[in-house]
């Protein structure tokens, strides 16, 4: 089958890193600078991605593979193949359209990216709060009160009151 295909289509013989040049009687020509072909039999080479500005080159473009980018310090990759670079925030913050904002009371973010998430509700698992949550850290749930003092009520103490004007997101 391969032999039959190559007799019918001379372009199928062109390996990765080359293209089938219609202007030169369909001979295999090397990809020009700043371009690549990752598969054989291509009639054109693809333009290499340029990792410029906020992007940094993680892997140079070659005749057979595209460049790969990551982000300059202070930014992190988003999307397939690091298609975008998003600004880092501090732990305890999230990125909004207005920039980095502190997590609202009752929420936390332990990373430089992503959104603030609500503290774990220990009482849902019948447990109590062992360590209070912060903007940067989730609460730590401990054994239920019943486990700590046999015969005692198993009601979890109420969660701390919310700050006025703040609610978890």
């Amino acid at each position: 089958f391969e032999r039959t295909r190559s007799l019918q289509d001379p372009c199928s013989n062109c390996p990765a890193g080359t293209f089938c040049d219609n202007n030169r009687n369909q001979i295999c020509s090397p990809c020009p600078p700043n371009s690549f072909s990752s598969a054989g039999g291509q009639r054109t080479c693809d333009i290499c991605r340029q990792c410029k500005g906020v992007f940094r080159t993680r892997k140079e473009c070659s005749s057979t593979s595209n460049a790969e980018c990551d982000c300059t310090p202070g930014f992190h990759c988003l999307g397939a193949g690091c298609s975008m670079c998003e600004q880092d925030c501090k732990q305890g913050q999230e990125l909004t359209k207005k920039g980095c904002k502190d997590c609202c009371f009752g929420t936390f973010n332990d990373q430089k990216r992503g959104i603030c998430r609500p503290w774990t509700n220990c009482s849902l698992d019948g447990k109590s709060v062992l360590v209070n949550g912060t903007k940067e850290r989730d609460v730590v749930c401990g054994p239920s009160p019943a486990d700590l003092s046999p015969g005692a009520s198993s009601v979890t103490p109420p969660a701390p009151a919310r700050e006025p004007g703040h609610s978890p997101q």
Epitope: N34, Q50, K52, V54, M84, C85, E86
Partner: antibody, heavy 118, light 110 residues
Framework: QVQLQESGPGLVKPSETLSLTCTVS????????WSWIRQPPGKCLEWIGY???????NYNPSLKSRVTISVDTSKNQFSLKLSSVTAADTAVYYC????????????WGQGTTVTVSS | QSVLTQPPSASGTPGQRVTISCSGS????????VNWYQQFPGTAPKLLIY???QRPSGVPDRFSGSKSGTSASLAISGLQSEDEADYYC???????????FGCGTKLTVL
């Protein structure tokens, strides 16, 4: 399709700050670089600086001490401030959208003329 | 004084082929791709060629670009009167971490 529109005062006094805004319509500001380019009367195009949608900036070294570019993604706008202007800053100012993976300016605003004069 | 060097003017008669050159250095054209912009009087520049030789949709195939080493060129075949405009080359400069332009070539159709 995406359109850019520059706005701001057409006349600025020497030593004052030139302030221009570029409004992006018909598309998102995310994922692109956004540049300011200027062209003095009868002269060459000069790159002033760019901002990436997430806040990364870079400026032409010859103007760096006087330039600030900022972005407001909630309004789909980005802005230029050029301080301590002189007559040499008189030019047509263009805002552009720059492709972030192959770096070319595929969308240009119509341009706004700024004259520096007392 | 522009980083990329272009001839200030070029001319040709209708139907002719005209080439505009653009010379740079290893930090720009030598290591990055070249773009070309067309500008008519009183209007904003328009992207004509990107990534050395790619045409945006709507640009006639009479326009072609090429690059070799630290130089690039724009070729216009079958010259037409409506091609009379200023043509700018541009590209990324690694030492600047930003784009650089040529000072433009004024094309006159005789």
């Amino acid at each position: 399709q995406v359109q850019l529109q520059e706005s701001g005062p057409g006349l600025v006094k020497p030593s004052e700050t030139l302030s221009l805004t570029c409004t992006v319509s018909g598309g998102s500001i995310s994922g692109y670089y956004w540049s300011w380019i200027r062209q003095p009367p009868g002269k060459c195009l000069e790159w002033i600086g760019y901002i990436y949608y997430s806040g990364f900036t870079n400026y032409n070294p010859s103007l760096k001490s006087r330039v600030t570019i900022s972005v407001d993604t909630s309004k789909n706008q980005f802005s230029l401030k050029l301080s301590s202007v002189t007559a040499a800053d008189t030019a047509v100012y263009y805002c552009t959208r720059d492709h972030s993976h192959y770096y070319y300016m595929d969308v240009w605003g119509q341009g706004t003329t700024v004259t520096v004069s007392s | 004084q522009s980083v990329l060097t272009q001839p200030p003017s070029a001319s040709g008669t209708p139907g002719q082929r005209v080439t505009i050159s653009c010379s740079g250095s290893s930090s720009n054209i030598g290591s990055n791709t070249v773009n070309w912009y067309q500008q008519f009087p009183g209007t904003a520049p328009k992207l004509l060629i990107y990534s050395n030789n790619q045409r945006p949709s709507g640009v006639p195939d009479r326009f072609s670009g090429s690059k070799s080493g630290t130089s690039a060129s724009l070729a216009i075949s079958g010259l037409q009167s409506e091609d009379e405009a200023d043509y700018y080359c541009a590209g990324w400069d690694d030492s600047l971490n930003g784009p650089v332009f040529g000072c433009g070539t004024k094309l006159t159709v005789l």
